[in-house]
Amino acid sequence: MRTEAQVPALQPPEPGLEGAMGHRTLVLPWVLLTLCVTAGTPEVWVQVRMEATELSSFTIRCGFLGSGSISLVTVSWGGPNGAGGTTLAVLHPERGIRQWAPARQARWETQSSISLILEGSGASSPCANTTFCCKFASFPEGSWEACGSLPPSSDPGLSAPPTPAPILRADLAGILGVSGVLLFGCVYLLHLLRRHKHRPAPRLQPSRTSPQAPRARAWAPSQASQAALHVPYATINTSCRPATLDTAHPHGGPSWWASLPTHAAHRPQGPAAWASTPIPARGSFVSVENGLYAQAGERPPHTGPGLTLFPDPRGPRAMEGPLGVR
């Protein structure tokens, strides 16, 4: 959901063009600025997990990655909200939370993410291939909906939390490699600029090869930060099938908000509000990655609830863990 920006390619300056040097180096900050700014429009993530201990229990977590403020979140199952989906919960930042069976507990996790615990035994409980959707209404972006279901590899009996053996995923390694090259390019440009500034009046002398700037190293987050960002498993419930459409809950505007002592709206304002909730991490490591995706005309893929850089018994797909960043 982002307008794409064409980022000019970074090229090393040609040695002979001394006059163009100043202009060329002026371009660099703009290119870098473009990389930072283009990471702007919304994305929605949906995470569906089945509890290993309670096979009929699921947790759905949804998040909105955008700059606007969220005015309403609707969670549905069986398809998108406007296409046969059945509303499970509606969360309003001021007027509170309304939920319908088999939803057990809906809550705000952060100002831009929610979680919903589902459980059930019988006709109204979800199955493993049920689609869950979250619709975020936000200002000024408008409304955006995304859906998710259990991943193909998640065998309920085997879905134990991944073991924290820190390993860098291949795509991350690639990104870090490219960011290293980019950084090296920038350092090299600055080096050339400084050399150009301090160069004495041209004199005939043998050219000296400039010492190569050390290659910048991109670091993976420490194990401590990985552990801090790792998402704890929560819960939701299965014997199968969304409630039939005749028992579907209201899809219209929430006229019932007025009579709503159901759950007081609880939206954590600070990092300490939900101890178990991963707070989106912001850091240079991530900025570089986001910048690279912006350059490639794409939003970074790691934009979900928590960073997982661990191998997973479920295979390479599961290793592609979400990373809570904007």
Epitope: Q47, C147, G148, S154, P301, P305
Partner: nanobody
């Protein structure tokens, strides 16, 4: 060989709804990213939206013109993706193409997708 087959296109009145489906067949591996693009007559192919699967989390991103009218959802196990289009406008008339990627880096650039469907025509009349 992997084939992506789109269906669900057709003629619809302005303000109406359509659901496009895209299914992968053949010797498929799990797709990490599936997206929709569209091409209106005389225009370039443009990105509509994409869905990316990453473990138990699904990431969905749309083009700005979608403005909440379209919803993209799918099933990675079946390599199937749907595009639910509501409040259709005449300017949504185009051939809609499905694209898939078996490498986990998502993209809205055409050349970054491994597989493409033949397209399905969507015509919105006033």
């Amino acid at each position: 060989q992997v084939q992506l087959v789109e269906s669900g296109g057709g003629l619809v009145q302005s303000g109406g709804s359509l659901r496009l489906s895209c299914a992968a067949s053949g010797r498929t591996r799990s797709m990490y990213v599936m997206g929709w693009f569209r091409q209106a007559p005389g225009k370039e192919r443009e990105f509509v939206g994409r869905i990316k699967w990453s473990g138990d989390t699904t990431y969905t991103s749309y083009a700005d013109f979608v403005k909440g009218r379209f919803t993209l959802y799918g099933n990675q196990a079946r390599n199937t993706v749907y595009l639910q289009m509501n409040s259709l406008k005449v300017e949504d008339t185009a051939v809609y193409y499905c694209a898939g990627r078996v490498v986990p880096l998502p993209s809205r650039q055409r050349d970054r997708y491994d597989y493409w469907g033949q397209g399905t025509q969507v015509t919105v009349s006033s």
